[in-house]
Amino acid sequence: GSERTCCPVNWVEHERSCYWFSRSGKAWADADNYCRLEDAHLVVVTSWEEQKFVQHHIGPVNTWMGLHDQNGPWKWVDGTDYETGFKNWRPEQPDDWYGHGLGGGEDCAHFTDDGRWNDDVCQRPYRWVCETELDKASQEPPLL
């Protein structure tokens, strides 16, 4: 199978997940594909602790995460429930702003310079964070 027992080379391990922090920019879909080629996904933030960990690594730079509403409701790329899950939007966000003049609204979420989230045009070339979970079976205690 494709289950992982250790992180890919140059990825950062944290709390049984592996993270890749880019230093270049891509559109949201292209960043997502970069992650998927490693059988990973754009980062899914499920707790304040994970938010702080990611924020520490990316610094004050706009960075894509695995959250979008391109098909209507907001969805996490790994199926994590959005409505009941962790959220860290900036005040008055998301706003699906149309005033940018690029056509359409804003359907993809990113970390802003202070770590809080904003929705923006998915074609903007922002940095990105990939995440992949380590083999859950390896978390089981050994049989005695």
């Epitope: 494709s2 140059n10 880019s22 230093r23 559109a27 292209d30 970069y34 998927r36 490693e38 059988d39």
Partner: antibody, heavy 121, light 107 residues
């Protein structure tokens, strides 16, 4: 030595099928996404398909979508391309290529020698 | 899809010449641009990745530059073994696409 070796090419009639294989050696095959790239006689290079490290995600050029299927067997260090409903315009040398990763950047850093597929009646 | 356009499609040059090949993308690809060399009957070989980074084992007479939509491959002093076809390729977005190639021939 890092090496990719394709096989399975040949002459096939339009509408027929063929399965290409690519045997990898000299590197940790399961750590790299892989691709197929083709080159029609006297023409340029065309990316055909890609597959993620563990095989969970696949990508296709529009020209082959629905007809070709990429797969891999990491236990055998082998990449495959199942080609169905073949057309004359699929005639080409087919190369398998390793996706080298250089930080955020990627490129086809290792190529096989290619296998010729001819679709003709 | 991102279209890649190379120019010229062919050129004639002599050993020792400085050769420049250009590649233009239909939209910005920042520096997600690779260059390959292909000799007749052989597989392509990676020369340059990330627009300007020299692949291991490639002679330093090869160099790449550019960002956004316009890129250049330069061979500072053409050697006999450099007569080949050169391709650019964008790795910004799937489907990955190649330029149509530039054939470097002996004058």
């Amino acid at each position: 030595e890092v090496q990719l070796l394709e096989s399975g090419g040949g002459l096939v009639q339009p509408g027929g099928s063929l399965r290409l294989s690519c045997a990898a050696s000299g590197f940790t095959f399961s750590s790299y996404a892989m691709s197929w790239v083709r080159q029609a006689p006297g023409k340029g290079l065309e990316w055909v398909s890609a597959i993620s490290t563990g095989g969970g995600n696949t990508y296709y050029a529009d020209s082959v979508k629905g007809r070709f299927t990429i797969s891999r067997d990491n236990s055998k260090n082998t990449l495959y391309l199942q080609m169905n409903s073949l057309r004359a315009e699929d005639t080409a040398v087919y190369y398998c290529a390793k996706r080298g990763v250089y930080g955020d950047f990627d490129a086809f850093d290792i190529w096989g020698q290619g296998t010729m597929v001819t679709v003709s009646s | 899809d991102i279209q890649m356009t190379q120019s010229p499609s062919s050129l004639s040059a002599s050993v020792g010449d400085r050769v420049t090949i250009t590649c233009r993308a239909s939209q910005s690809i920042t520096n997600f641009l690779n260059w390959y060399q292909q000799k007749p009957g052989k597989a392509p070989k990676l020369l340059i990745f990330a627009a300007s980074s020299l692949q291991s084992g490639i002679p330093s007479r090869f160099s790449g530059s550019g960002s956004g939509t316009d890129f250049t491959l330069t061979i500072s002093s053409l050697q006999p073994e450099d007569f080949a076809t050169y391709y650019c390729q964008q790795s910004y977005s799937i489907p990955w696409t190649f330029g149509q190639g530039t054939k470097v021939e002996i004058k």
